[in-house]
């Protein structure tokens, strides 16, 4: 039985996307709560056992700032990588000729606040490759649509996105 609104011939309108406002975050709860990206599980360093949980992202459709020249910004958890790759496609579709740019990924330098998800490869700060800040509100919305677990229009200069830990996702899906 075809339910209401599911009949043949009905045109599907693409979802109208509204940009996030400066300082807005989605979902509207704190980043490290259960309804968003979940708790901080501990800093990952290059010589820690958990370093193997991080995977490099060599997607050619993503620009990495890599200010440290160490490749650290490319390292992230698999879930973060999956969401980022999905977002990269959305960005190119939204703005032809423009790519997704990552300014911060995994951080080993201690730049970020205590218990930042950057320290375990679960957070990225992103911009567009043209660094046109008038696009960042919509970039944040695209990040929400791409499936990031928490998206924050944190700064005039970037959008902060984070994901749940791999184990919490696996437990939920029964994997």
């Amino acid at each position: 039985i075809i339910g209401p609104g599911r009949g043949f011939g009905k045109r599907r309108h693409p979802k109208k996307l509204t940009p996030l406002a400066y300082k807005q975050f989605i979902p509207n709860v704190a980043e490290k709560t259960l309804g968003a990206s979940g708790r901080y599980e501990g800093k990952i360093t290059r010589n820690s056992e958990r370093f193997k949980e991080l995977t490099p992202n060599y997607n050619p459709d993503i620009i990495f700032k890599d200010e440290e020249n160490t490749g650290a910004d490319r390292l992230m958890t698999q879930r973060c990588k999956d969401k980022l790759n999905a977002l990269a496609i959305s960005v190119m579709n939204q703005w032809p000729g423009v790519k997704l740019r990552v300014t911060e990924g995994w951080d080993e330098d201690g730049h970020h606040s205590e218990e930042s998800l950057h320290y375990e490869g679960r957070a990225v700060d992103i911009t567009t490759s043209d660094r046109d800040r008038s696009k960042y509100g919509m970039l944040a919305r695209l990040a929400v649509e791409a499936g990031f677990d928490w998206v924050y229009y944190e700064s005039k200069a970037h959008i902060h996105c984070s994901v749940k830990a791999e184990n919490s996702v696996a437990a939920k899906s029964g994997g």
Epitope: K65, E67, E68, N69, T70, T103, D109, G110, H111, T127, R131, R133, S134, S155, K156, A157, H158
Partner: antibody, heavy 123, light 105 residues
């Protein structure tokens, strides 16, 4: 606390290369997040950013000076340096070294400054 | 290249509020800093990140930035605030405004 001190010749001949060094004391130049910078001020005029260097070696230069400027860092000596080639009288200025911090994506602000050193270009 | 425009001079009576403007295209999308420079001295950062005050800077200094204009406000201006003030914004290339001479009458 962190302090910056410029050093170098106060007089340079036209067409020569101006060379200045900034010594950082009270902290490591290797600290992430800082952009070690040079800024100059012509006599009685405003401030002009020359360029900045990150501890990793990445450099950023004022487009109007880029062809003549080289900024380098020596982490072992906790120093960074400025070289400005083919100088003319128009390069006569007080040269400041400064520590830049990043508000965002190259949104620098300069929170620490050296005392400045006057460099005169004259034959 | 990007340009920031400031009025060359601003005058204020002691105890009054001084406002110094800085304008540039889409300046509201950038972070603005302000520096105070007294004769013969190095510049001192008084405002960064549009409206943040470094430690040691009096509360009478405040900043705002939206649209194409940033403003440095000095409330209850004192004689010691007489100086040159420079706005600055960055975008892979730090740019300074031309400076404003604040005179406390």
């Amino acid at each position: 606390q962190v302090q910056l001190q410029e050093s170098g010749p106060g007089l340079v001949k036209p067409s020569q290369t101006l060379s200045l060094t900034c010594t950082v004391s009270g902290g490591s130049i290797n600290s992430g997040g800082f952009y070690w910078s040079w800024i100059r001020q012509h006599p009685g005029k405003g401030l002009e950013w020359i360029g900045s260097i990150y501890y990793s070696g990445n450099t950023y230069y004022n487009p109007s000076l880029k062809s003549r400027v080289t900024i380098s860092v020596d982490t072992s000596k906790n120093q960074f340096s400025l070289k400005l080639s083919s100088v003319t009288a128009a390069d006569t200025a007080v040269y400041y070294c400064a520590r830049g911090q990043d508000s965002g994506d190259y949104d620098w602000y300069f929170d620490l400054w050296g005392r400045g050193t006057l460099v005169t270009v004259s034959s | 290249s990007y340009e920031l425009t400031q009025p060359p001079s601003v005058s204020v009576s002691p105890g009054q509020t001084a406002s110094i403007t800085c304008s540039g295209e889409k300046l509201g999308y950038k972070y603005v800093s302000w520096y105070q420079q007294k004769p013969g001295q190095s510049p001192v950062l008084v405002i960064y990140h549009d409206n943040k005050r470094p430690s040691g800077i009096p509360e009478r200094f405040s900043g705002s930035n939206s649209g194409n204009t940033a403003t440095l406000t000095i409330s209850g201006t004192q004689a010691m605030d007489e100086a040159d003030y420079y706005c600055q914004a960055g975008d892979s290339s730090a740019v300074f405004g031309g400076g404003t001479k604040l005179t406390v009458l």
